[in-house]
Interface confidence: low
């Protein structure tokens, strides 16, 4: 699998992964004890036909061209979890692995 | 996890899974021995904020609102393989499980 990596200086218009630090304090999410911020990353960019297509299915739907199919969009194709320490609704402190919090790779699907 | 299922008569505008039969013969893909057609399905529809969001990450990126982030789009969130019999590039007959050929669920990511 392959995905492009970009930053805020990139001129790349195609589907790419960009750095993004999510700051829970800035959001006012005070129920999150740790981390106060983490590197989440995000996907942005255009999906030209066949570029960075993760699945053969994407190609097949393009071929079949059903009503309402909008073509692929730039979306996470690989994500990873982070461990978090937080208050749950009962004010208990929970330590747990929260899935799909970090974008590792972007692609067109 | 939850995803909407629709058909060609549905009036649903939100992100939904639609039936789609892929016909390899119609595409002229004569290197595929079996199946000649299969039910692939596809995703289509609008992703209003928070509707059918698969990942907390999607919500966080919306909160952080970085440059160029386009908002979530309707894309497969669960896929499954099919078994196929096909000729490879060396004209050998291969029987194998091809991943991510069928859309089982759609969501916004």
């Amino acid at each position: 699998d392959f995905g492009l990596d970009c930053d805020e200086h990139s001129t790349e218009s195609r589907c790419c992964r960009y750095p993004l630090t999510v700051d829970f304090e800035a959001f006012g999410w005070d129920w999150i004890i740790a981390p106060k911020r983490y590197k989440a990353n995000y996907c942005s960019g255009e999906c030209e036909f066949v570029f960075l297509q993760k699945y053969p299915h994407t190609h097949l739907v393009h071929q079949a061209n059903p009503r309402g199919s909008a073509g692929p969009c730039c979306t996470p194709t690989k994500m990873s979890p982070i461990n978090m320490l937080y208050f749950n609704g009962k004010e208990q402190i929970i330590y747990g692995k929260i899935p799909a919090m970090v974008v590792d790779r972007c692609g067109c699907s | 996890d939850f995803g909407l299922d629709c058909d060609e008569h549905s009036t649903e505008s939100r992100c939904c899974r639609y039936p789609l039969t892929v016909d390899f013969e119609a595409f002229g893909w004569d290197w595929i021995i079996a199946p000649k057609r299969y039910k692939a399905n596809y995703c289509s529809g609008e992703c209003e904020f928070v509707f059918l969001q698969k990942y907390p990450h999607t919500h966080l990126v919306h909160q952080a609102n970085p440059r160029g982030s386009a908002g979530p789009c309707c894309t497969p969130t669960k896929m499954s393989p099919i078994n196929m019999l096909y000729f490879n590039g060396k004209e050998q007959i291969i029987y194998g499980k091809i991943p991510a050929m069928v859309v089982d669920r759609c969501g916004c990511s």
Partner: antibody, heavy 122, light 110 residues
Framework: EVQLVESGGGLVQPGGSLRLSCAVS????????KGWVRQAPGKGLEWIGI???????YYASWAEGRFTISRDNSKNTVYLQMNSLRAEDTAVYFC????????????????WGQGTLVTVSS | AVVMTQSPATLSLSPGERVTLSCQAS??????LSWYQQKPGQPPKLLIY???TLASGVPSRFKGSGSGTDFTLTISSLQPEDAATYYC????????????FGQGTKVEIK
Amino acid sequence: EVQLVESGGGLVQPGGSLRLSCAVSGFTLSHYVKGWVRQAPGKGLEWIGIINIEGSTYYASWAEGRFTISRDNSKNTVYLQMNSLRAEDTAVYFCARGHDNFGYSYHDFNLWGQGTLVTVSS
Amino acid sequence: AVVMTQSPATLSLSPGERVTLSCQASESIHHELSWYQQKPGQPPKLLIYLASTLASGVPSRFKGSGSGTDFTLTISSLQPEDAATYYCQTYDGISHYGVAFGQGTKVEIK
């Protein structure tokens, strides 16, 4: 006890090769980013490279091609293979573990070995 | 590649004084900054990560701040055991995980 222990340092001639080992104990090798950092006598810290959780390796531009990081999960050991050594490679070489900081594969290091001295001289 | 510049090179202060160390990045690194303390003959010790988060077991007199290109490590009340060299470090998890250290600031006790 959670620790990293480097070995394999010593005197080597210019143009020679050396393989450093970093034996880890008290934690699972493959669950953490591992890095190598060096420090020339009286100088600052210099990053060499890392091997991430998936086993992919990344190097400083100056180390690319000459230095290779690998790991053997069964031996709980990370390696640094150094080829075409030069006098300016003389340094203490540290093995370090990425921080388990609730976060995503950060490459700051919260556990370090004591270091092993490599001297390149004829 | 990002370049980290620390100032001053050396600092000599008395116990109890407030210490301010500076680290500047050649381009924006968001919050991706760590601080280390290294004493002679020892490996570095992580003090701060993500610009301001105190690492486990680090005394609360150490405080990190800043984002973007300008970062500061403050020791609110200098203790004799704080005599060491302090390094800032950034890491880039987007483009090939490049890691860069500053050249260090040596803190001496008068």
